[in-house]
Interface confidence: low
């Protein structure tokens, strides 16, 4: 009863404080009443507070289990190998940037930037992506030329539906080429990298949609969209992969104030998709061919398709006029890879089921940071690894395939008691020779328990020490796959383990 009375007092005092704030009472008065409230709360007792605390990660975040980490590292390995194969260097930047660095770079999405609480010093924000920090890095270091990759976590104050693989803290894997080069060669390489990675990951059939910001802007201009509405109409058009043209048109007309006939003109264009023939067709379009921007964009896309044919990936690319990626900083070619769900009916087109990689050209971003506005042309891509992790995890669960969470090659075990010293000596020899080895942390473990652990952990080999074997100078080596057991001379053990696990010679 005392506790209930105290809780009631806390509630009333809380209401009183809120009332004072609403009445805009003096800071001193509010502070005085807040102090009283804190004292009352303290009386409720710390133990009660502890019971109330629910142990969970913050909204939109998650822990990664060893199994999930194993999947993640495999995915990263595929991506990094590809980036390195294409000659990229690696950089890293701070998790937080000056708030000013991120301000005005993301358009409508700026609301989702995490600002850090001011500690009386600099105003800081958590990075929202890796592209803006990269542009800041280039401008700050006066770099005009670099091919780099960057894999790191970014933060978005979204309200995520985590069951759908959306988070507030998530990884991005970015590859970018900065520098003044001949048109479309770096852009084509970015698309090649995207296709290589998505093919290597074997997550299913995919399609890369390509468009150009200049074509979009030119198209809006010839259709009669006012300049001030380009960006907002862009965001409507970008929904076409999720909803019907009718719904997009209703949004443009009903909410964004576009004339119905203007919307219809846009509809004639944005519902088209195809290959290089569509590019050529649009170059002959009576209206578009009169727009300088659109013609430049279409000319570059024509060239891009030539390079994509040479790279052997043109069959994976679709020129799609409805692609209108949201970020404000894109200036030229834009692209987005979607996983395809195969059609249920014969003759239907494959259905896109969500973006798994995206990118484009952003020639103006670095100039935003340069005091003299000097531009560094850039083009890049971002792999949507969180989505890919989810897909790979689901696939593994469906196949019930066992995922190894360690790389241990051999378990050092003993067949009798009192052989801890021998196990420690042997495991140390193996570590020193660069072999990944483990032992159980018990003085006298039962052999059965050691073998059970070995099998459950999926360790390929077990080295068993016994008194007789010690006398004979051999170790019993058993393979989990074949169940065969052989006696190996102690001095040959390292070589034999290497041979059986295909490990090259290395030491730590």
């Amino acid at each position: 009863a005392d506790r209930a009375a105290l809780e009631e007092l806390v509630r009333l005092q809380g209401a009183h404080v809120r009332g004072l704030k609403e009445q805009k009472a003096s800071a001193e008065q509010i502070e005085e009443e807040v102090t009283k409230l804190l004292k009352l709360k303290a009386q409720l007792g710390q133990d009660e507070g502890k019971q109330k605390f629910v142990l969970k990660t913050p909204k939109g975040t998650r822990d990664y289990s060893p199994r999930q980490m194993a999947v993640r590292e495999k995915v990263f390995d595929v991506i990094i190998r590809c980036f390195k194969r294409h000659g990229a260097e690696v950089i890293d930047t701070p998790v937080f940037e000056l708030k000013e660095t991120l301000t005005g770079k993301y358009g409508e999405d700026s609301k989702l930037i995490y600002d850090l609480k001011d500690q009386g010093g600099e105003l800081l924000s958590l990075r929202y992506d890796l592209t803006v920090p990269f542009a800041r890095y280039l401008a700050m270091n006066k770099l005009t030329n670099i091919k780099r990759y960057h894999i790191a976590k970014v933060y978005r104050r979204d309200n995520p539906a985590m069951t759908r693989g959306r988070y507030r803290e998530f990884y991005q894997c970015d590859f970018d080429i900065a520098g003044q080069f001949d048109p479309m060669i770096p852009d084509a390489e970015c698309l090649k990298i995207m296709c290589e990675i998505l093919s290597s990951l074997q997550i299913g059939n995919f399609l890369v949609k390509v468009n150009d910001r200049r074509i979009l802007d030119g198209m809006f201009a010839v259709c009669g969209v006012p300049d001030s509405k380009f960006r907002t109409i862009c965001s409507s058009v970008d929904k076409l992969d999720k909803v019907s043209w009718e719904e997009v048109k209703n949004e443009m007309v009903g909410e964004k104030g576009l004339a119905p006939e203007v919307a219809d003109r846009i509809g004639d264009y944005v519902q088209q998709h195809g290959g290089v023939s569509l590019v050529e067709q649009l170059l002959q379009d009576p209206k578009l061919s009169q727009n300088k921007q659109a013609v430049e964009g279409l000319g570059d896309l024509k060239l891009l398709f030539e390079y994509l044919i040479l790279f052997g990936i043109d069959d994976k690319i679709s020129f799609d006029l409805s692609l209108a990626r949201g970020l404000d900083y894109y200036t030229g070619v834009i692209y987005e890879a979607v996983l395809l769900q195969m059609p249920t009916q014969a003759g239907e087109e494959p259905l896109g089921v969500g973006s798994i990689a995206a990118g484009g050209r952003y020639d103006g971003l670095v100039g935003m940071f340069d005091p003299k506005g000097r531009k560094v042309p850039c083009v890049g891509l971002s792999i949507g690894v969180e989505r890919i992790f989810s897909i790979v995890e689901q696939r593994l669960e469906a196949s019930e395939e066992k995922v190894r969470t360690t790389e241990t090659q051999v378990l050092v075990a003993s067949a009798q008691k009192k052989l801890l010293e021998e196990r420690l000596k042997l495991v140390s020899e193996l570590w020193d020779a660069g072999i990944k080895a483990e032992l159980l942390y018990k003085k006298n473990p039962k052999l059965l328990n050691q073998l059970q652990y070995w099998e459950e952990a999926g360790i390929p080999l077990v080295a068993i020490i016994g008194e007789q074997e010690l006398r004979d100078g051999v170790i019993k080596l058993r393979s989990v796959a074949s169940r065969e057991e052989v006696d190996v001379r102690r001095e040959d053990l390292v070589e034999e383990i290497r041979r059986r696990t295909n490990q090259p010679l290395s030491t730590c």
Epitope: N159, S235, K256
Partner: antibody
Framework: QVQLVQSGAEVKKPGASVKVSCKAS????????IGWIRQAPGQGLEWMGD????????NDNEKFKDRATMTADTSTSTAYMELSSLRSEDTAVYYC???????????????WGQGTSVTVSS | DIVMTQSPDSLAVSLGERATINCQSQ?????????MHWYQQKPGQPPKLLIK???NLESGVPDRFSGSGSGTDFTLTISSLQAEDVATYYC?????????FGGGTKLEIK
Amino acid sequence: QVQLVQSGAEVKKPGASVKVSCKASGYTFTDYCIGWIRQAPGQGLEWMGDICPGDAYTNDNEKFKDRATMTADTSTSTAYMELSSLRSEDTAVYYCARGEEQLGLRNAMDYWGQGTSVTVSS
Amino acid sequence: DIVMTQSPDSLAVSLGERATINCQSQSVSTSTYNYMHWYQQKPGQPPKLLIKYASNLESGVPDRFSGSGSGTDFTLTISSLQAEDVATYYCQHSWEIPWTFGGGTKLEIK
């Protein structure tokens, strides 16, 4: 068809707790969040929070954070909302509702339970 | 929390006439977000979703209902009032936690 069926009316004394259940059928329970909304007599609607059974993740309205606990049992496709330290002003009809999702992340609630009347009186 | 101001509190409209209900959201400054939904509630019944995302009609809802607006100002319109439309109408935003509802507009027949 989608249905949310809630537990029956409750009469509680101040300081007690109440646990309202919401049994879902007609769809995959783990694919949608379940929100809890209350309506005091003659008053408007007040969102208390939601739970996404797919990962047991909850979004809370700070106002109820210390008193409302939302849980879900995927084996029975049932969501629960427990409200503790009841006071007379908690007298209301409590609704569960399914969080509809379109174009991403923000919820509209497309299917509602019939409501559970909770009366708090000494 | 985002405060939703619904107007008018009550409304009497003749059968066959147009009814318009407004909802203003505080704190959402960006002009292109449309995370606003409309519900109809009849006495003794749970609310029913009519319009989602400002203008998308929920399936099964008669097309005399329509929604418009973006940013901070939203409108629910019933083009030709029918007897069965007598109810209380609520707007709800889902821009940030916590979701909040407007105070409701009671619609009656004149």
